[in-house]
Interface confidence: low
């Protein structure tokens, strides 16, 4: 007869491991007992049950309840046994050594290897701005055993490095992601992808890029000069910028106070009816906690009567 | 000291591919990328790629994407780089340097591509 | 692509003399705190010799009469007082994004 094995069992940390150990022999023959034992090169046999025909499983004391016999049915030849809740530290060799009858001894090893999926953790780098060279903008670590992959999924183009480092029964990886950091990138989801042979699907976690800009400001509203007259209702200015954080406002007049009347809405400048008064240089001045940006325009309110007057003067000079 | 131990010339014909070794010494070799740089005869540098011998990621030179692959083998500490459907234009000499500052160049394979 | 523009292709020194080598970038390769260009030398037949690093920075081993300066988009490089042994070409390069990207070499002659 023989004995039937594997050469390496797997299992996730936690699981059940089923520790097989099957003599295949010619009719009439008996398994009297199967002994069970830990023998890592250099620790010598540590004992973990005896499985006997007659007497039923003794299991040693270092291994007191968490070895057992398979669920029923069960075949009088089959020596496997289960070893509950597999930790880390019961990583290695296994022999199961069957005693027959009448063909004598037989012995066979395998190897336990325990699974440690990785918890992955994805830390954001410094805060991004653009105009920046290339920088970190997320580095990603997962610690398993076997060492993980540690990938990264996005649109966004950048360049990673890693670097592992090796504990006694597991390894630590890190990834970092660097980018140059630019206003488009702005919203865009980084993710960190952590394959491990412990994990049904891969582990993801996103980071949602933030990139800190403030674009050139600029004023609407003169781009037609004749629209601003005495007297018309309704004129406004308009600041016109973006940024992230998204920028705030402030309106000023460069040559005195704003004038009476005029109010200041956020990015918008409403006039009252215009008169004189409102002619002048005003600045839109934006900014958030990256920049700060200025824009100014001159307003020159017409007055009807003079522009006339000018006509005429024209007219009666040719 | 470290070293990038490149092979010698190598000849080869339009279409075919070339394989080039570069052995590193003196290092911990999964600490640096390996990149690779191109110099024609009388002519500029080129940087064709790099990858992470930690974990096999590449990143790579557009112009070089796709006939150009980047491999490493941890356990000889070798980097390798295979270009594939050579022409004439590949003549040149192929520079493996260790990454993150390129202090340390190997010392060039000569790739002559020619009927 | 970055494309950096050396200048001028050659130049020829007298021993003793300075040697002044210009690389300008088709955009900035600066932040306020680095700048990352970098320059190499290169004899016949010999791969490139890393001189100085983030611009201004002297790597070890190499002689002090080599600086280099510059920031944004326009970089150079000194030699000062010039010797035969500094007969080469030389390049910059720089390492702002993908892919780096190198000058097209400038020849120094000692006469």
């Known amino acids: 007869g023989e004995l039937e094995t594997s050469d390496v069992v797997t299992v996730v940390l936690g699981q059940d491991a089923k520790l097989p150990c099957f003599y295949r022999g010619d009719s009439g023959e008996q398994v009297g007992q199967v002994a069970w034992a830990r023998v890592d090169a250099g620790e010598g046999a540590q004992e973990l049950a005896l499985l006997h025909s007659k007497y039923g499983l003794h299991v040693s004391p270092a291994y007191e309840g968490r070895v057992e016999q398979p669920p029923p049915p069960r075949n009088p030849l089959d020596g496997s046994v289960l070893l509950r809740n597999a930790v880390q530290a019961d990583e290695g060799e296994y022999e199961c050594r069957v005693s027959t009858f009448p063909a004598g001894s037989f012995q066979a090893r395998l190897r336990l290897r325990v699974l440690v999926p990785p918890l992955p953790s994805l830390n954001p780098g410094p805060a991004l701005e653009e105009g920046q060279g290339l920088t970190l903008a997320a580095s990603c670590t997962a610690e398993g055993s076997p060492a993980p992959s540690v990938t990264w999924d996005t649109e966004v183009k950048g360049t990673t490095s890693s670097r592992s480092f090796k504990h006694s029964r597991s390894a630590a990886v890190t990834s970092e992601f660097h980018l140059v950091p630019s206003r488009s990138m702005n919203g865009q989801p980084l993710t960190c992808v952590v394959s491990h042979p412990g994990l049904l699907q891969d582990q993801r976690i996103t980071h949602i890029l933030h990139v800190s800009f403030l674009a050139e400001a600029s004023v609407r509203g003169l781009e037609d000069q004749n629209l601003w007259h005495i007297g018309r209702e309704g004129a406004m200015l308009k600041c016109l910028s973006e940024g992230q954080p998204p920028p705030s406002y402030n309106w000023t007049r460069l040559d005195g106070p704003l004038p009476s009347g005029v109010r200041v809405d956020g990015d918008t400048l409403g006039f009252p009816p215009l008169t004189t008064e409102h002619s002048g240089i005003y600045v839109c001045h934006v900014s958030n906690e990256f920049s700060s940006r200025d824009s100014q325009v001159t307003v020159d309110v017409l007055d009807p009567q003079e522009d006339s007057g000018k006509q005429v003067d024209l007219v009666s000079a040719s | 000291e470290v070293l990038l131990q490149q092979s010698g010339p190598e000849l080869v014909k339009p279409g075919a591919s070339v394989k080039i070794p570069c052995k590193a010494s003196?290092?911990?070799?999964?600490?640096?990328?390996m990149d690779w740089v191109k110099q024609s005869h009388g002519k500029s540098l080129e940087w064709i790629g790099d990858?992470?011998?930690?974990?096999?990621?590449?990143m790579y030179n557009e112009k070089f994407k796709g006939r150009a692959t980047l491999t490493v083998d941890k356990s000889s500490s070798t980097a390798y780089m295979e270009v594939r459907s050579l022409t004439s234009e590949d003549t040149a000499v192929y520079y493996c340097?260790?990454?993150?500052?390129?202090?340390?160049w190997g010392q060039g394979t000569l790739v002559t591509v020619s009927a | 692509d970055i494309v950096l523009t050396q200048s001028p292709a050659s130049l020829i020194v007298s021993l003793g003399q300075r040697a002044t080598i210009s690389c300008r970038a088709s955009?900035?390769?600066?932040?306020?705190?680095?700048?990352?260009m970098h320059w190499y030398q290169q004899k016949p037949g010999q791969p490139p010799k890393l001189l100085i690093r983030?611009?201004?920075n002297l790597e070890s081993g190499v002689p002090a009469r080599f600086s280099g300066s510059g920031s944004g988009t326009y970089f150079t490089l000194n030699i000062h007082p010039v010797e035969e042994e500094d007969s080469a070409t030389y390049y910059c390069?720089?390492?702002?994004?993908?892919?780096?990207?190198f000058g097209g070499g400038t020849k120094l002659e000692i006469k």
């Open positions: 340097v260790r990454g993150r500052g390129f202090a340390y």
């Open positions: 003196g290092y911990t070799f999964t600490d640096y990328t």
């Open positions: 990858i992470n011998p930690n974990n096999d990621v590449t």
């Open positions: 955009q900035s390769v600066s932040t306020s705190s680095n700048s990352y």
């Open positions: 983030f611009a201004s």
């Open positions: 390069q720089h390492s702002w994004e993908i892919p780096y990207t």
